[in-house]
Structures are given as C-alpha cells and as structure tokens.
C-alpha cells in the first residue's frame, strides 16, 4: 500500500492544513462578534488520491466505488479529522461577552 | 436565513444519503470477506450550497471564505455526519472470522 | 467556570529569583485568541503590566523589565509559570494572573503577595 | 510606550450621582481601551472592553466611550457598593499599560 502521507500529486497538492487570512467581514462575522479583527482561518484543502489519509473504511470504499462509477460516486474530500478552539469576544444586547468554540479552526485533515 | 434542509439546487441535487449496489468484487473485498457478496453502501452524495446542512461553524466559514476566493478555498463538502455499523464475514487463516465495522456505512450527511 | 490561582515562595531574599505558578481552569491555554497575563501591584499603588504569553507560545514583555523577566507555559498541566530575576525590595507587590483575550483581562486570580526582605 | 494618564486621582461624591472618569493615551489606540474596578482587598474585575462595550454581568448604570486619545467611564447613578478604584488600560499596542487609577469615595 502506499505511503498514506505521500502525495502521488506533487508536493502540496493532496488533502492537508492550510491557513487563510481573514477579516471579520470576510467571515460575515462583523455584525456579532467585536474581536478579533483578523483571524488565521486554518482548514483542509487538497486532493484525495486512494489511499491518501484515509479517515475509515467507508473512504475506502468511496475511492473504490469512483474509479468504477467517476459520475455517480465523488471521490473522497479533504475534511477536518479534529478541531482547535477559538474563543470570540461576541456583541449582546448588552454589551460583550466571551464565547468559546471547538468546531472553528481545523487542527489537521483527512479523506473521508 | 434559508432553510438548513431545503435544497435550493433543485430535488436531490444536495447532500444527502445515496445507496450504491456494489459487489465485493467492486469493494476492492473478494480476496478477503466471504459475507456478503454484495452490499447496498450507504455513501454521502450531492452538492453543498450555502446554509445547507452546515455541520458546524467550521462549514459556515469555508463557504463565506469560497463566495470570497472560490479559487482558493473549495465549497464544502458532503460527507457522513454518522455511520451505521455492519457485520462482515472474513476469510481467516483457519477459516472464518465475525467482524462489526463501525464507519463503514453512512447513516446521516451534512456538509462540512 | 474560569479560574486562576496564584502560587509562589511569599517571601524571597534580595538577589533571589521569584519563581510564580498560575494553575488555569475553565479555559484552554491552547485555544485560539486566548492568553494569560501576569500584572503586579505594590501595596496602595497602580497596576503594572509584566508579561504574557498566547496560545501560540508569542511572549510579550513589560520592556522595563524585560532583562529579568521569563515567561512559559505548560498546556498540559494547565499552567503558565513567570520567573523574575534578581529581586529587590523594590519587587515587593501582589502578583496576579489573569485571563488575557485579545489583550483585555477577563478573569483574574486572587493574587499572591511576595515580600522582598533580607 | 504609550502613558495612560487617568483624571481625577481621587473622587468624591453622592449616592445618585453621575460620576464621570477620564483617561488620556499619549497617542492614538483607536478604541483599543479596557476599563477595571477594584474593590478593597479584591483583585480587578473587568468592566469595559473596546472603550464602550460593557461585559457580561456589569450594571448598566456603568458606560464607557471614547476613541483616539481620549476616553470616559461613567457611572449614570453612583451606588454605594461601586466605592472602588477604576483602572483604565490600552491594548492597541505593547507594552500593555494602565492609568494610575481613580479612587472612587463616597460623600
């Protein structure tokens, strides 16, 4: 089996963490949260080759089924496999408040 | 806000849960599970539009940061939010084997 | 909920080096845009910023100071640890940590007094 | 480093009355400013974020505003319980710093 690591594509080109610069408007955050301004949005982009990181057996079998059935089966896609936490300093009708979440920024990636 | 599980596609032109017939032989599986010898897979398929089935914040930000830079930063995409375990038959050195599989085949979909 | 404690010797000799521990609860020294900040405060005077450190391990210091300051933290154990060289009398205060998000003090310890005397 | 110089050091005044603080940054921090109160024997409790955003819990007879250089918390009818110290801090830039603080009594 190949290395579930090695990208048969080239260098950077197969399902892995990238970071994106974002402003709150960018996020169509600007309306409810005061902080922070800028955000280092981390999430997964790339290709999935067969047997590249494969999250389960179901991703397997998804890989398998797209090489026979290309038009009816899509092949695996590059999703988080865990998150990091972020926390926002939110507007309220009040004022602020903080609030803390776990399912923001991608902390690495697999093929599902 | 639109409607989470309104498709604005069209008719099951968004992500949600699609059955395949397929074989061992087209599992990539005949060299070693004897049972069964053709399984109706369960498997995420279709598009993710805005709002749709948002698994999480995460997906609420990849597809603002997509509008934005839609050559960077892919849509999200469909993939199992659950799984529905499954028993298999497997060829043994000595013969035989019972084993449940826990993320074999998809129950539920959101996109992420 | 979020809380901070403070420990530390209470009283050190002049020359010596305060060694503080802040255990954090509640919160995650490794979530992003969170931080923890270590503030002093002399017996009827003003606050006095004296470092911190962020969930990514970038390390701000109060720049009077900088010399003799260090600053670190340890995830796992929920705690961040700030050492002060080459005390004075003049390093006699009440020591706080508190909960830095993007640079504003949330939550604060109760703070620990530390006395300088020979 | 930018000085946050707080006005008056000390004052007094009436159970009802609107009292307000000052605080001056020696250069622009935008609306990078915090406000804390300190009670007697107390650590400080945050108050104000982003010069006029009150944080969750805080009385709404407390108000913050300001931007640039200049800045102001107001307490729109004193209680007897705000009897405190009042810090101001910027964090537009590092170092972080505080006003000496404002010792808030009652007549």
């Known amino acids: 089996a190949r290395n579930g690591d090695r990208c048969p594509l080239g260098p950077g080109r197969c399902c892995r963490l990238h970071t994106v610069h974002a402003s709150l408007e960018d996020l169509g955050w600007a309306d409810w949260v005061l902080s922070p301004r800028e955000v280092q949005v981390t999430m997964c982009i790339g290709a999935c080759p067969s047997q590249f990181r494969e999250a389960n057996m179901h991703a397997q079998i998804k890989m398998n089924l797209h090489r026979l059935k290309p038009d009816t089966v899509p092949a695996p896609c590059c999703v988080p496999a865990s998150y990091n936490p972020m926390v926002l300093i939110q507007k309220t009708d009040t004022g602020v408040s903080l609030q803390t979440y776990d399912d923001l920024l991608a902390k690495d990636c697999h093929c599902v | 806000a639109r409607n989470g599980d309104r498709c604005p596609l069209g008719p099951g032109r968004c992500c949600r849960l699609h059955t395949v017939h397929a074989s061992l032989e087209d599992l990539g599986w005949a060299d070693w599970v004897l049972s069964p010898r053709e399984v109706q897979v369960t498997m995420c398929i279709g598009a993710c539009p805005s709002q749709f089935r948002e698994a999480n914040m995460h997906a609420q930000i990849k597809m603002n940061l997509h509008r934005l830079k839609p050559d960077t930063v892919p849509a999200p995409c469909c993939v199992p939010a659950s799984y529905n375990p499954m028993v298999l038959i497997q060829k043994t050195d000595t013969g035989v084997s019972l084993q449940t599989y826990d993320d074999l085949l998809a129950k539920d979909c959101h996109c992420v | 909920q979020v809380q901070l404690q403070e420990s530390g010797p209470g009283l050190l000799k002049p020359s010596q080096t305060l060694s503080l521990t802040c255990t954090v609860s509640?919160?995650?020294?490794?979530?992003?845009?969170?931080?923890v900040g270590w503030i002093r405060q002399p017996a009827g005077k003003g606050l006095e910023w004296l470092a911190n450190i962020w969930w990514n391990d970038d390390k701000y210091y109060n720049s009077a100071l900088k010399s003799r300051l260090t600053i670190s933290k340890d995830t796992s154990k929920n705690q961040v640890s700030l050492k002060l060289s080459s005390v004075t009398a003049a390093d006699t205060a009440v020591y706080y940590c508190?909960?830095?998000?993007?640079?504003?003090?949330?939550?604060w310890g109760q703070g620990t007094l530390v006395t300088v005397s020979s | 480093d930018i000085q946050m110089t707080q006005s008056p050091s000390t004052l007094s005044a009436s159970v009802g009355d609107r009292v307000t603080i000052t605080c001056k940054a020696s250069q622009n921090v935008g609306t990078n400013v915090a406000w804390y109160q300190q009670k007697p024997g107390q650590p400080p409790k945050a108050l104000i974020y982003s010069a006029s955003y009150r944080y969750s819990g805080v009385p709404d007879r407390f108000s913050g505003s300001g931007s640039g250089t200049d800045f102001t918390l107001t307490i729109s009818s004193l209680q007897a319980e705000d009897v405190a110290v009042y810090y101001c801090q910027q964090y537009n830039s590092y170092p972080l710093t505080f006003g000496q603080g404002t010792k808030l009594e009652i007549k």
């Open positions: 508190a909960q830095e998000v993007y640079g504003w003090f949330a939550y």
């Open positions: 509640g919160f995650s020294l490794s979530t992003y845009g969170m931080g």
